[in-house]
């Protein structure tokens, strides 16, 4: 069974998938469509790296530009380094500027909804 066929079989169960499952799925060459990606739990999507989302969505990653104002895409973009976002070739803006340090302060994020940044 190839990645696409596997994805079709598990698609209906993905809504509640944790980050670990999504990371594993990104290695399966599944090409998840954007509509399915946007139904995933926001807290499961946020820790994914640009490389993992690129592998998870395959060619459908191009659609992130069109959905950049909608959750979870918007929140995920804010968590990524701008350098990494640039590799997607979509002109996405709003990532963490180059040279900034990301502090993973759970309380800070819970209150503000955005990561805490220290300037260069």
């Amino acid at each position: 069974m190839n990645g696409s066929e596997y994805f079709v079989k598990i698609q209906s169960f993905l809504g509640g998938a944790p980050t670990e499952d999504l990371k594993a799925l990104s290695q399966q060459n599944v090409s998840m469509d954007l509509a399915t990606f946007m139904k995933l739990r926001t807290d499961a999507v946020l820790p994914l790296t640009v490389a993992e989302v690129q592998k998870l969505l395959g060619p459908h990653v191009e659609g992130l530009k069109a959905e950049e104002r909608h959750r979870p895409v918007r929140d995920w973009i804010l968590r990524q380094r701008q350098d990494d976002l640039d590799t997607l070739g979509l002109g996405l803006q709003g990532g963490i500027p180059n040279g900034y340090l990301v502090l993973d302060l759970s309380m800070q994020e819970a209150l503000s909804g955005t990561p805490c940044l220290l300037g260069p």
């Epitope: 509509a35 139904k39 959905e67 997607l88 070739g89």
Partner: antibody
Amino acid sequence: QVQLQQPGTELVKPGASVKLSCKASDYTFTSYWMHWVKQRPGQGLEWIGSINPSNGDTYYNEKFKNKATLTVDKSSSTAYMQLSSLTSDDSAVYYCARGWYFDVWGTGTTVTVSS
Amino acid sequence: DIVMTQSPSSLTVSVGQKVTMSCKSSQSLLNSSSQKNYLAWYQQKPGQSPKLLVYFASTRESGVPDRFIGSGSGTDFTLIISSVQAEDLADYFCQQHYSTPRTFGGGTKLEII
């Protein structure tokens, strides 16, 4: 204004290869993916594949996986598509098109495969 | 692959008439999270490259006359030309960008008397 310039015609022999070009101007080349589309008379439009000019990642329609190879040259803002082992079925107009909903199309290259 | 079916295959109308063409997809093109339908319409005049008219099923591309109206959701979509002009002589294609491979409808040829 934004343009995608393609050569008008290519005449090639059966079994040979051809490399089509698509030169982009007046936009940031690495901020939009490039797609390639085939059009044969009376047979509508077929998506061949796409390339991310920023990192060179390519995605293909299964039907064209062994036929087309997509590349880019960032320094000249040009996308390329090489077609191999050409047959009469490959005679068509080939377009490049920009971005997720193909908001700008190239001028098209007519490929004629004939001995 | 998603199959796109357009009808009618050709239409002949007079200048000033209203024209309706249909595009149906074999599966829903609606992203329920953003309420966007991943469907575009293109116009191809004789001897020219295709041109984007409408995206997200109903959003008119910049510079496209407002007589071109896209509508529909899910699997059924419509392109209306409210008052046909002589320069609208062309083939009209729909395309889905919900999933890969991108697929196009067979087209509707608009002829004008």
